[in-house]
C-alpha cells in the first residue's frame, strides 16, 4: 500500500521527561513532541512504536508527513489534529497499527492539506459515518483526501457491533459526498462478503481500487460504469466463482483499466462460458493465463484460457420425482 514515506536525514528527538510539560501555547517552530523524532528539513515527524495513547498536542506547524504508527491510541476524537495555528501543511498521515477501535466524527477536521490517510491494521469496531466528512450535512465541504488506505481494519468477530461492517465502512466513504476527489482506495483484507451497490458510483475520481483478500463471492450488483478514470482494480484472493456478462462489459468499457483476478476459486461449469470467451479476447486482465478452475473436481487446475464451450457443462437438475434421497 502507498503510505507516506520520508527522506528525512536529520531527526531531532525530544527527551521523554518533557512529556508532562505539554504547553497550551503554540509550539515553537523547532519543537518536537516527546517520544517523537522530527526533521524540519524533511517536514516529517515520526512517533513510531512508542505506545502513545493520544495524539501529541505539540506537533510542529511545519509537519507535512506524520507517522503515528504502532501506538495504542484506541480512540481518535473529533478534532484530534485541530491546532492553533492549524497543521496547514499536513499532507500525509499514517496511523496504521495503532490499536484504534473508534474513529469519531470530525476526527480529521482542520487539516486542509491532508491528501493521504492510512488507517490500516486497526480494529475499527466503530468508524463514524462522519469520520472523513466532518459533518452530518447531506453535502459536506469536499475533503482534500486523494488516497485512503483502509487495509485490514476489520475488528475480531467478537468485537464487531451488531451491524454490517461493510455498511459501516461504506457509510463513512459516502457521507456528505466529501470524498468525490478520492483517487486511491484500499480496502484489502477486511472479510468483505459483498460490496454495497451504491459505493462506487459515488467515488467517480477513483484511479486505484484494492479489494483484494476479502470474501467477495459475486460482483453481480456492483457497477463499475461510472469509474471512467479507473486504472487498477485488485480483486485477487477473494471467493469469486464467475464474472457475468454485465460485469465483463462494464470492465471492458473502462479505457485505462487493469484488472487483477488471481486466486479466486473459479467454478468451471456452463455459467463460465461468457467469462472464458471474454478472457480470450481481453487485454485488461493481468496474468490471465494463471487463472485456473477450482471446481468442479473434474475441472480442477485447468487453465481458464484453454477451456472451450464443450468443456463447460452443468449437471442436469433432476425433476423432483427423479431425485433420490
Amino acid at each position: 500500500s502507498s503510505s507516506p514515506t520520508s527522506s528525512a536525514s536529520s531527526f531531532s528527538s525530544s527527551a521523554p521527561f518533557l512529556a508532562s510539560a505539554v504547553s497550551a501555547q503554540p509550539p515553537l517552530p523547532d519543537q518536537c513532541p516527546a517520544l517523537c523524532e522530527c526533521s524540519e528539513a524533511a517536514r516529517t515527524v515520526k512517533c513510531v512504536n512508542r505506545n502513545l495513547t493520544e495524539v501529541p498536542t505539540d506537533l510542529p506547524a511545519y509537519v507535512r508527513n506524520l507517522f503515528l504508527t504502532g501506538n495504542q491510541l484506541a480512540v481518535l476524537p473529533a478534532g484530534a489534529f485541530a491546532r492553533r495555528p492549524p497543521l496547514a501543511e499536513l499532507a500525509a498521515l499514517n496511523l496504521s497499527g495503532s490499536r484504534l477501535d473508534e474513529v469519531r466524527a470530525g476526527a480529521f477536521e482542520h487539516l486542509p492539506s491532508l491528501r493521504q490517510l492510512d488507517l490500516s491494521h486497526n480494529p475499527l469496531a466503530d468508524l463514524s459515518p462522519f469520520a472523513f466528512s466532518g459533518s452530518n450535512a447531506s453535502v459536506s465541504a469536499p475533503s482534500p483526501l486523494v488516497e485512503l488506505i483502509l487495509n485490514h481494519i476489520v475488528p475480531p468477530e467478537d468485537e464487531r457491533q451488531n451491524r454490517s461492517f461493510e455498511g459501516m465502512v461504506v457509510a463513512a466513504l459516502l457521507a456528505g459526498r466529501a470524498l468525490q476527489g478520492l483517487r486511491r482506495l484500499e480496502l484489502a483484507s477486511n472479510h468483505f462478503l459483498y460490496l454495497p451497490r451504491d459505493v462506487l458510483a459515488q467515488l467517480p475520481s477513483l484511479r486505484h481500487l484494492d479489494l483484494s483478500n476479502n470474501s467477495l463471492v459475486s460482483l453481480t450488483y456492483v457497477s463499475f460504469r461510472n469509474l471512467t478514470h479507473l486504472e487498477s482494480l485488485h480483486l485477487e484472493d477473494n471467493a469469486l466463482k464467475v464474472l457475468h456478462n454485465g460485469t465483463l462489459a462494464e470492465l471492458q468499457g473502462l479505457p485505462h483499466i487493469r484488472v487483477f483476478l488471481d486466486n479466486n476459486p473459479w467454478v468451471c461449469d456452463c455459467h463460465m462460458a461468457d467469462m472464458v470467451t471474454w478472457l480470450k479476447e481481453t487485454e485488461v486482465v493481468q496474468g490471465k493465463d494463471r487463472l485456473t478452475c477450482a471446481y468442479p473436481e473434474k475441472m480442477r487446475n485447468r487453465v481458464l484460457l484453454e477451456l472451450n464451450s464443450a468443456d463447460l457443462d452443468c449437471d442436469p437438475i433432476l425433476p423432483p420425482s427423479l431425485q433420490t434421497s
Partner: antibody
C-alpha cells in the same frame, strides 16, 4: 489415466548442465501448468518454478531464477528443466507435477547426482 | 510469502491410535492441502481445500482448520499410513510453498 514419466537417474559432473524431461500423457498437455519441485535427501519439498505449456510463460522461485530454465515441446507433450552450473548442492530428486491450486499428479522423480 | 510450519517434525503411533499433526501459517490462508509421501516414492495429493479427501484416500483421514491453524487427523492409525505428510498453502499464483513435513512412524 494421467501419467508423468521421468527418467530414473542422471549423473553429471560439477559445473556441467543437465536437461531433465517429463513426458505427459492421459490429458490435454496445454490445459494445465507444469511445475517442478526439488527434494534433497531426507529433506522437504521446494518449489522451483512452473510453465504454461500453451504459451511458454514461466514463473520461478527466486532461489532458482539464475540456474533453472523451463521449456516445453508441445508436439511431444514433454516439459523440460535445464539446470546449469551444477554443484553437489544440486544433488536431489526432481519431480514434475501437474498443478494449479494444488499438485494433483506427480512424476516418479529423477534422481540427479552431481559428482566428479 | 506465507511460511508454513509443521509440528511435530517426527512422531510415532501404534496401530489403532488416533493421530493429529498440525500446520501453522505465518499469515491467514484460505485453505491448506496435504500430501502423503511414503519412503522412496513421489508425493501424492492426499487432502485438498483443507478437508476434501482425494479419491481413494481412506475415510479414517480428515482435515480441518482455518486462518493460520490447520490439522490432519487419522482416526485409527494403520501400518500403511507411515509416511511423511506435507502441507501446502492454497494458491494459484507463485510462489507455492510447503511445510517442512511431519514424519509419521509406526510404533
Amino acid at each position: 489415466q494421467v501419467q508423468l514419466q521421468q527418467p530414473g537417474t542422471e549423473l553429471v559432473k560439477p559445473g556441467a548442465s543437465v536437461k531433465l524431461s517429463c513426458k505427459a500423457s492421459g490429458y490435454t498437455f496445454t490445459s494445465y501448468w507444469m511445475h517442478w519441485v526439488k527434494q534433497r535427501p531426507e529433506q522437504g519439498l521446494e518449489w522451483i518454478g512452473n510453465i504454461n505449456p500453451s504459451n511458454g510463460n514461466t514463473n520461478y522461485n527466486e532461489n532458482f531464477k539464475s540456474q533453472a530454465t523451463l521449456t516445453v515441446d508441445k508436439s511431444s507433450s514433454t516439459a523440460y528443466m535445464q539446470l546449469s552450473s551444477l554443484t553437489s548442492e544440486d544433488s536431489a530428486v526432481y519431480y514434475c507435477a501437474r498443478g494449479g491450486w494444488d499438485f494433483d499428479y506427480w512424476g516418479q522423480g529423477t534422481t540427479l547426482t552431481v559428482s566428479s | 510469502q506465507v511460511v508454513l510450519t509443521q509440528s511435530p517434525a517426527i512422531m510415532s503411533a501404534s496401530p489403532g491410535e488416533k493421530v493429529t499433526m498440525t500446520c501453522s501459517a505465518s499469515s491467514s490462508v484460505r485453505y491448506i492441502h496435504w500430501y502423503q509421501q511414503r519412503s522412496g516414492t513421489s508425493p501424492k495429493r492426499w487432502i485438498y481445500d483443507t478437508s476434501k479427501l482425494t479419491s481413494g484416500v481412506p475415510v479414517r483421514f480428515s482435515g480441518s482448520g482455518s486462518g493460520t491453524s490447520y490439522s490432519l487427523t487419522i482416526s485409527s492409525m494403520e501400518a500403511e499410513d507411515a509416511a511423511t505428510y506435507y502441507c501446502q498453502q492454497w494458491t494459484s499464483k507463485p510462489p507455492w510453498t510447503f511445510g517442512g513435513g511431519t514424519k509419521l512412524e509406526i510404533r
